[in-house]
Every structure is written in C-alpha cells, then in structure tokens.
C-alpha cells in the first residue's frame, strides 16, 4: 500500500489557446486530469488501472501552482494504491479549459482539451522527487513526482506491513525495510522475549521483563546459580537443590550433629588436651596443676597429698616441699629411719621387716592406704568420672553421678534420646541436637507416631503365633488374644521362657 504523488509546479500557455489552436474566451481557465496506470511501451487510452485524480481550476493561461498540501492536499496530487508497487508505471496528464463551473468530463466539449502529455518508465519507492518538464507546440508543463509507502508499510515495493508496538506481543519499531528492530532489553523473532540480567543462569533462572533474574525452584542468588540446601540443613552445603552434604565434623540428616565438639567449641581450658568421645561429648586431659571437667580449676600441688608418712606439704612457686616427721626423709618423706619395733603402721596395719630390719612395709586394712596406713582411701582423687560426672565415695567403693545425657560406670557414654524408644508404632527415631525426630510407618503420624491415620491397627498383622488381633477403636491400638502356650503383648513368648529385654 502506498501513494503516487504528483506535484504540479508551472503551466505555460502564453497564447491562451486550446489544442485545436482556437483561443479560449476570455482566457483558458485551466484544470488537470491525471491518469496513472500500469506500464505500457506505448501509452494508449484505456482504464487508469492505478487510479485517477482531477484538480479544480488552478489558473488562467500561464501560472505557477503553489504547494497546497497543508490546505486540503490538492497539490501534490495523491493517487493511493493498495497493492505491491511494481516499480514501473504510465502517466497521462491532461490540461482542460473549463468554460463553466461543471468540470465533469460529460459536461465539457471534446475540444476543451488544452494539452495532453504521456510518460512511462521505472520508479522506485523513495522520498526523493523526480523533476520533469514536457513541452508541446503551444504549452509547457513542469512537474515532479514520487512514490512513497502508506503509513505502516515498508520495503522496496511497500508490501511489508509493520506496526510498531510495545505490549506483550512485541516490543519493537519498524526498520525501513519492514523488519522489526527490538526495543532495548528485548529479543526474539517478534521481540517478545526479555533479555534477562547479564549472567542470569540459563537453566536455573528466567525473567518476565528485561534485566531481571527470577530463580526456578531450588535455586537462589542474584544470578540463580546457588542451590538451596535441604530445609533445616545446619552445617552442610549442596551442589544440586535440596541436598545437605555435611561440613567436616558434622553428621546427621541435617548436618546438625556435632562430631567434632573439640574443634567447634574448644571446651578444654588451661592448655588441656581435648578428645572427642562421641556425638556432642568430649574428654579433657588436664595439664599438671589443673582439674575439673574442662580443666577449668587450678589445682594446688599439695592437693594430691604428695608427702607420705605424715609429712606436711608446703606450696611453693616452683612446686611444693615436704616437711618430714621424725624418722622419715626424702622428697616425699618416703624413706624411713624406723623399724617394726617402732610400731609405725596405723589403723591396724601389719608391719613386715625388710632388708634385715633396716626397713619395713605396712600392709594396710581395707579403706586405708599410705606408707603407714595413715590415709583413708579417697577413690575420687583421680577424677574418674567423665563428662562432668560427680564422684561419690561409698565406703569401700565409689560411684559416678552422671550429668543428664550421659551414662556408664564413668559417665563415659552419651545417652541417645532415642534409647528410651520414644517413637510409637515402630517409628524410627533420629537423634537431633535439640531432641529427636520420629519417622512414622505407614498409617501413623504425630510427633511420636502416636496418631493412627485411617489404617487398621491390625492391618500389619502384629500378633505372632496365630494369635487373634483386635483393633481397640478407643485408643487406635491393637490387642492380641494369645493361643494356649504363648504370652506377651504380641503373643511372642512361649510360656516358661522369660522374655529377654535388651536392658
């Protein structure tokens, strides 16, 4: 679709005559008829296949035609077409004399024709005007012409329709050839695809408008290149979404179980050596002069009663010093000048001569110790209880009172929260840092798998030895009716064989 434009510029008819040579009375009141048609080697009469247009009376005899495109569009003349411009044309321009006001062809005498010109040739679509001048014996016509495309039509022959748009079906303007030119931030055949933020991950990110980066499920970060670990993952990472790969020293489903308490918490004080002794438990080996679970207590070197045979201990900056009682000598008063004759053994100890009577040794009764049986046995002096356990003397023996979460003779074992089998209905127990979690079997739910969910309690055939199973609807549990010779909640024990429990 386009327009053939013809601009009439000047018409010269100095003698004011018609084509027949007859003069116009009183002068030649001149108007023009234009016929545009397909290319003909010899322009001949016939249909104006590309269109026709007529002007009003523009002047008398000789006159210049002023540009009147703003005041009604009469000059240049417009010949619109709704087809592909072929690139060639034929043009006929006739100048007519109008004796009256009726300019219709049938109202004019045939001899009212002043002049007729016919041209043909090639014409490309473009903004530039082609200037031409046609002269006959009596007249001269100067004019220019061009072909331009209608609004929204483009290309060499005005055949490409293109309408700029900026909505969700395209964001573009039109190039001179009718191709689309995407607005900044848009791409695709129809400029409908936004260009995401530079670096936005091709697979894991997307965008609905330019310079945006929206993450697909399982991904995060400005460029959607960071995976999201499993919900609740504490000390772990991921390489694909929802993973929880534990950092060194951590374990468990959520990497929240501390396998290296020593490194992560440095609980041992005063240069003590820390040893991991299980999940969230540790043992501190104190340097000389320190004591306590975390070696946090400074120990007087006299506290260990190093002086024997009743020697008194004096603390010094660089250690201690033993003041020996009469009859004893040595660093710890360990050497005696006494013999059995001096009855050196206290608390009912028996004296035995040594080295031909030059020395002796005491054999102490239970609960007493020392070279002379002078010390009551304190079985707690060696801090035997681990993990902060409290040592208690119980006559000839000792016992450890353990902190919550520990057990064993010396509180050396960490008590699993799962040890008391808190998960009902065969639920699997998982130790967590702040408690436990139950994974329930099919048909049960709740924090401890205590809730039956629409599955018959007897469906899993819990009763052994051909016992009859009944569902207790009030408690959502089962009851086994045992055959003769079997007992137990599931009829699992033959009569006469006591059940062996793991505890």
């Amino acid at each position: 679709s386009g327009v053939f434009q013809l601009q009439l510029q000047e018409f010269i008819n100095e003698r004011g005559v018609l084509a027949s040579g007859r003069p116009c009375e009183p002068g030649c009141r001149t108007f023009f008829r234009v016929c545009l048609k397909h290319f003909q080697a010899v322009v001949s009469p016939g249909p104006c296949t590309f269109g026709t247009v007529s002007t009003p009376v523009l002047g008398t005899n000789s006159f210049a035609v002023r540009d009147d495109s703003s005041g009604g569009g009469r000059n240049p003349l417009q010949l619109p077409f709704n087809f592909t411009w072929p690139g060639t044309f034929s043009l006929i321009i006739e100048a007519w004399h109008a004796p009256g006001d009726d300019l219709r062809p049938e109202a004019l005498p045939p001899d009212a024709l002043i002049s007729k010109i016919a041209i043909q040739g090639s014409l490309a679509v473009g903004q530039n005007w082609l200037l031409d001048e046609q002269t006959s014996t009596l007249t001269r016509l100067r004019y220019s012409y061009r072909v331009i495309c209608s609004d929204n039509y483009y290309g060499d022959n005005c055949s490409r329709l293109c309408k700029k748009r900026n909505d969700h079906f395209g964001h573009y303007v039109c190039q001179p050839d009718g191709n689309l030119s995407c607005l900044p931030g848009w791409t695709g055949e129809y400029c409908q695809q936004p260009i995401c933020l530079s670096g936005c991950h091709e697979q894991n990110g997307y965008c609905s408008k330019p310079a945006e980066c929206l993450c697909r499920p399982g991904w995060q970060g400005r460029l959607c290149n960071e995976c999201i670990p499993h919900n609740g993952c504490r000390h772990g990472t991921c390489s694909t979404p929802w993973q929880c790969t534990c950092d060194e020293g951590w374990g468990g489903l959520f990497c929240d179980q501390d396998l290296n308490y020593c490194t992560h918490h440095s609980p041992c004080k005063n240069g003590a050596t820390c040893s991991n002794s299980g999940q969230r438990s540790y043992t501190c080996t104190c340097r000389p002069g320190y004591t306590g679970v975390d070696c946090e207590l400074e120990l007087s070197e006299c506290d260990s009663n190093p002086c024997r045979n009743g020697g008194s201990c004096k603390d010094q900056e660089d250690g201690y010093h033993c003041l020996c009682p009469p009859g004893y000598y040595g660093l710890h008063c360990e050497h005696s000048t006494l013999s059995c004759a001096d009855s050196p053994c206290f608390n009912g100890g028996s004296c035995r001569e040594r080295n031909q009577g030059a020395n002796y040794a005491c054999e102490c009764p239970p609960n007493f110790t020392g070279s002379n049986c002078e010390k009551k046995v304190d079985r707690c002096t060696s801090n035997p209880c681990a993990n902060g356990g409290q040592c208690l003397n119980r006559g000839p023996s000792r016992m450890c009172r353990c902190r919550p979460g520990f057990t064993g003779t010396y509180c050396e074992l960490h008590v699993s929260d799962c040890a008391r089998n808190p998960c009902a209905h065969g639920g699997t127990c998982h130790d967590l840092e702040n408690g436990l979690m139950c994974t329930c079997p099919a048909g049960f739910s709740g924090r401890r798998c205590e809730v039956r969910t629409s599955i018959d309690a007897c469906a899993s055939s819990p009763c052994f030895n051909r016992a009859t199973c009944y569902t207790d609807l009030s408690t959502d549990t089962f009851v086994c009716n045992c055959p003769y010779g079997f007992v137990g909640s599931r009829c699992e024990f033959p009569v006469g064989l006591p059940p062996s429990f793991p505890w």
Partner: antibody, heavy 121, light 104 residues
Framework: EVQLQESGPGLVKPSETLSLTCTVS??????????WGWIRQPPGKGLEWIGD???????YYNPSLKSRVTISVDTSKNQFSLKLSSVTAADTAVYYC?????????????WGQGTLVTVSS | SYELTQPPSVSVSPGQTASITCSGD??????VSWYQQKPGQSPVLVIY???QRPSGIPERFSGSNSGDTATLTISGTQPMDEADYYC?????????FGSGTKVT
C-alpha cells in the same frame, strides 16, 4: 492439532469465587510463541477479554476486572486457570479459554468450546 | 478505556459483497483481528494483522485498516457466512473487542 478444554463448576453462589481450568492437549503450553487467555460472553451479548498469561507466569488483566481476577499456569499439567472473586449475577457468562498467537499479532487462533457459569444462590 | 464501535447489523444478498466496519481512535496504527461466531459455537479467527487470512479461511474474506477504521469485506457472500462478527485490537496490554455485527 492443539485443543483446549474448559472445566469447572457451572453454578457459583454470589460473593463466592469462580474457578475454571483450561487443559491444553496436542501441544505444549511452554512456548514463547503463545499467551493463554480467558474471554467471556454474557448470554446474548458480545465478547469480553478477561486476561492472559504465558508459560513463565507473566499475567495481563482487563483493568475493569483486575481487582478480582487471578490467572495462573501449571506447565507440568499443561493447564492454566482462572479465578474470579466476589462474583455477582453480572458475571454469569460462557467462559472461553483461547490461545493468543504472537506470530499472528495476538490473534486468538484456537478456542475451547466454552463453559456456561451461572451465578445464582 | 479504549473502545471499538461496530454497526449492530449488516444485511446482504447471497453473492453480493458485505462490508463490516470497526472504528476506534487511531485504529490504523494497531493490528486488527476479526472473528466469526455462529450460534452456539466458539469464535473462529478469520482475519489477523488487518488483512491476513489463517489457513482454511476462504479467500472471499479480506480485511483492511487505515485511519480510524478497519473493514472486513466478504465478497460473494454465502448463506453459511451468516453469523456474528467481532473486531479485536490490543490497546497497550489489554485486549479489546468490538460490540459485534450480525450479518444476515
């Protein structure tokens, strides 16, 4: 050949929410060449565009209905859905889902058969 | 809001040409689609981008659009062409339908 099929309740009470689903078969909803739209037609009246969505979830709504309309897409099921809240008798209409083609300048080249939704107590 | 205006009805004799107009402000700068809807059926796209025919649509359907008016022309109208016809354009991000024209 792609086919569209609307589904949902035919009767909705006033003030409640109208919910419809359009299932696309014979082609993938996950194409950048199409938007998926909802159009309605009250009995004996003309067509009214409600809104549309593409496969990544970008939505566009008719301003006159925007406050009440939600359109969503589920690419895994090859479906898109319409929710219209606080309905009145004026929302009684045949509801169509349609495929709007980017290469066709936004022309809707495929339509569902339509489902009549009546708003009445 | 943007509006498209159509005549309520157009009558035509079989074999003659029917022209349906659709008017809107600066409509010539927008792409116009035309839909045919027969009673009890879903609409069918007959023209897109002003003058393009989808495959399967007869050549007797043609369209044009300039200025403020788009026109759907049915040359050599047949009885089967009796239907409602709707024009449609996009104003910014919103789809707008004309009021519809009944062709008898």
């Amino acid at each position: 050949e792609v086919q569209l099929q609307e589904s949902g309740p035919g009767l909705v009470k006033p003030s409640e929410t109208l919910s419809l689903t359009c299932t696309v078969s014979g082609g993938s909803i996950s194409s950048s060449s199409y938007y998926w739209g909802w159009i309605r037609q009250p009995p004996g009246k003309g067509l009214e565009w409600i809104g549309d969505i593409n496969y990544i979830g970008s939505t566009y709504y008719n301003p006159s209905l925007k406050s009440r309309v939600t359109i969503s897409v589920d690419t895994s099921k090859n479906q898109f859905s319409l929710k219209l809240s606080s309905v009145t008798a004026a929302d009684t209409a045949v509801y169509y889902c349609a495929r709007e083609s980017v290469p066709l300048g936004g022309g809707a080249d495929e339509w569902g058969q339509g489902t009549l939704v009546t708003v009445s107590s | 809001s943007y509006e498209l205006t159509q005549p309520p009805s157009v009558s035509v004799s079989p074999g003659q040409t029917a022209s349906i107009t659709c008017s809107g402000d600066m409509l010539g700068d927008k792409y116009v689609s035309w839909y045919q809807q027969k009673p009890g059926q879903s609409p069918v796209l007959v023209i897109y981008e002003d003058s393009q025919r989808p495959s399967g649509i007869p050549e007797r359907f043609s369209g044009s659009n300039s200025g403020d008016t788009a026109t759907l022309t049915i040359s050599g109208t047949q009885p089967m062409d009796e239907a409602d016809y709707y024009c449609q354009a996009w104003d910014s991000e919103t789809g707008v339908f004309g009021s519809g024209t009944k062709v008898t």
